[in-house]
Interface confidence: medium
């Protein structure tokens, strides 16, 4: 290995390295053989030491992480912002839908308030929780709404002479509601529409939140030591030879990056599928698959269902009178 | 008297942005999001190229660094030599993705499966029967007189500016226990700051 020329110093390298690591003791005064180096393997004398090499590796991995974060910043912001906006919008839709329904009860069936408000409130609370991922069954939510409403409708509108809120008859009436299909096909209709629209809404929000998670994961990837070595060799080893202004070759950079990102690039196939599947879902979000549409029209369907009960009131009162006779007798005692 | 903190239909925000010419619907916002996301469809496959283009790379210089020496930009050595005596790039690729990446791939597979099962098949009429069944006139039959409703045509009177329940001394929201006689619900009052309504009493 030839000795360095007599006028060679590591001055330039030293001033650059000082910016990375204040304190100059790691930079040789003049080029050295560098036999202890593991990454920037010298062809001749070098201005790098083992300690400098370690610092370069650390810096290279940090650079890579920052580059990755800046690459995903716009995408991350896009999904985070939209996830928040849609979640808030859906909550507002639910609140408006509840208000519509309460208005319908207050102005058409004042005798059913305030109990109806309570049941409506519970129903829409469950709707909100379901959208946010709660483990609630939509059919159960709808059944609970109609199960709760019917005893109030029966005791307040159809048979107002009965004493209120006696658990015995309420339980019997809840059972009768399903057995006698008191509300006709309306509960089933609401179940279908609400479950379809809420499922789609829920999965839409879940998908957006997963999108954020995907970006966050790749954003905070820690690169392997092997990758750190490759990056150091590409970005910093030229400095050891005093080549401060030279840049890596483009093709070489691509090869290194593909090596470092081999694992990350494997996400590509599933990411593409994610966007295309989300597009398909969004294209289908209308009519009964659009929760705004369904929830904001619920007041009307619930009104129709109560009218259905009223229409069949005479027959129902007779049948229920027999069916729940035992409970009623116990009440009158 | 207590007021219900939210109007049925109108939100003060409408009044503030009434001058805006183009208003977005939720569905148009969804479609816009998809269009923007589609511009990122190659995000992961393009990452290596993105990072190279955003880090110092020889573009106009005649000479460039290949990891070992200074070479001419278009020479065979420009891409090849830098990888010699280093470690096997193929080995690096063979290691497979990081555990966190594998986890996220599994989650993506799962959500993709869910999205596919939830998507409405193309060309399918969207449950037309369900969409319309029982919705036009309830189940009242042809004779509308059969329908008994406390306001005949099903109209709902809503108090002043559609703020209903104005006379009630308690809030309707079940966040408060029934019977709690409060002036407005704390939770909804918080909402009113950003989603308040018409002219409040």
């Amino acid at each position: 290995q030839p000795p360095p020329p007599p006028d060679a110093t590591c001055h330039q390298v030293r001033s650059f390295f000082q910016r990375l690591q204040p304190g100059l003791k790691w930079v040789p005064e003049t080029p050295v053989p560098g036999s202890d180096l593991q990454v920037c393997l010298p062809k001749g004398p070098t201005c790098c030491s083992r300690k400098m090499e370690e610092k370069y590796q650390l810096t290279a991995r940090l650079n890579m992480e920052q580059l990755l974060q800046s690459a995903s910043m716009e995408l991350k912001f896009l999904i985070i912002q939209n996830a928040a906006v849609f979640q808030e919008a859906f909550e507002i839709v639910v609140r408006h839908a509840k208000n519509y329904t309460n208005a319908m009860f207050k102005n058409n069936y004042p005798s059913l308030t305030p109990q109806a408000f309570e049941f409506v409130g519970e129903f829409f609370t469950d709707v909100s929780l379901y959208i946010l991922g709660s483990d609630i069954n939509v059919d159960d939510m709808v059944n609970e709404l109609f199960d709760s409403l019917f005893p109030v409708i029966y005791t307040q509108m159809m048979n107002p002479g009965l004493p209120e809120s006696v658990l015995d008859i309420n339980e019997c009436l809840r059972g009768a509601r399903r057995d006698l299909k008191v509300f006709g096909s309306f509960p089933k209709l609401i179940m279908t529409q609400v479950s379809k629209s809420l499922q789609v809404t829920r999965i839409f929000l879940q998908a957006l939140n997963l999108g954020i998670e995907v970006i966050n994961t790749t954003d905070h990837l820690k690169f392997s030591k092997d990758c750190g070595r490759m990056l150091t060799r590409m970005w910093y080893c030229s400095y050891c030879q005093g080549l401060m202004m030279v840049k890596p070759c483009g093709g070489y950079c691509n090869v290194v990056m593909q090596g470092c990102m081999a694992g990350v690039v494997e996400i590509d196939k599933y990411w593409r599928e994610y966007i295309l599947s989300l597009e398909e879902l969004v294209n289908g979000m209308y009519r009964i698959y659009d929760m705004e549409n369904v929830l904001l029209g619920l007041f009307s369907t619930i009104h129709d269902s109560i009218q259905y009960v009223q229409k069949n009131g005479g027959k129902l009162t007779t049948t229920i009178g027999k069916l729940c006779a035992h409970s009623q007798q116990r009440q009158y005692r | 008297s207590a007021y219900y903190p939210e109007d049925l239909f109108i939100d003060k925000k409408i009044l503030k942005v009434a001058h805006v010419e183009h208003e977005e619907t939720l569905s148009s916002r969804r479609r816009e999001l998809i269009q923007k996301l589609k511009s990122f469809i190659n995000f992961y496959s393009a990452l290596p190229g993105y990072i190279c283009s955003h880090s110092p790379v020889a573009e106009n210089d005649t000479l460039c660094w290949n990891g070992q020496e200074l070479v001419e930009r278009y020479s065979q050595k420009a891409a090849r030599n830098g990888m010699k005596n280093q470690f096997n790039l193929h080995e690096l690729k063979m290691k497979g993705p990081e555990p966190v990446v594998s986890q996220i791939i599994d989650k993506l597979k799962h959500i993709n499966q869910l999205l596919r099962t939830m998507s409405v098949p193309k060309g399918k009429v969207l449950d037309k029967s369900l969409d319309e069944e029982g919705l036009e006139s309830g189940d009242c039959g042809d004779d509308e007189d059969e329908c008994i409703g406390s306001s005949g045509d099903g109209m709902v009177k809503v108090k002043n500016q559609l703020r209903f329940l104005a006379e009630l001394a308690y809030d309707l929201d079940v966040d408060d226990a029934p019977g709690n006689k409060q002036h407005g619900n704390q939770k909804d009052n918080e909402i009113t700051t950003s989603h308040s309504v018409g002219n409040m009493p």
């Epitope: 507002i92 839709v93 549409n293 | 049925l8």
Partner: nanobody, 123 residues
Framework: QVQLVESGGGLVRPGGSLRVSCAAS????????MAWYRQAPGEQRESVAA???????IYIDAVQGRFTMSRDNAKNTVYLQMNNLKPEDTAVYYC?????????????????WGQGTQVTVSS
């Protein structure tokens, strides 16, 4: 391009009647709960009535019993029949979707405001 065009307004004496229409293009309004709004000079825009996709309507007290909102899905149009008009009904009447939900600077489900139709009730 979504467009809502209101028409049918005019000058009418107290106690008179008018029927205003709102024709939509570029959107199928049969899937929306639609509403009529009005704005009197110097006043805030207020909602007057709404009609669900199934034809059920809701009204504010000030117009209850005098106004009737209806829709013709085949014509993609909603109507507001105004009877027994009063001077306080004087305003520009607009239609839009009822679920006009605003969130800060993000706005949704509004179909965009039309030019409105002027209703003047005066003797």
């Amino acid at each position: 391009q979504v467009q809502l065009v209101e028409s049918g307004g005019g000058l009418v004496r107290p106690g008179g009647s008018l029927r205003v229409s709102c024709a939509a293009s570029g959107v199928d309004i049969s899937t929306y709960t639609m509403a009529w709004y009005r704005q009197a000079p110097g006043e805030q825009r207020e909602s007057v009535a709404a009609i669900s996709t199934t034809g059920r309507s809701i009204y504010i007290d000030a117009v209850q019993g005098r106004f009737t909102m209806s829709r013709d899905n085949a014509k993609n149009t909603v109507y507001l029949q105004m009877n027994n008009l009063k001077p306080e009904d004087t305003a520009v009447y607009y239609c839009n979707s009822a679920d006009d939900l605003k969130i800060g600077t993000q706005y949704f489900k509004g179909l965009g405001w039309g030019q409105g139709t002027q209703v003047t009730v005066s003797s």
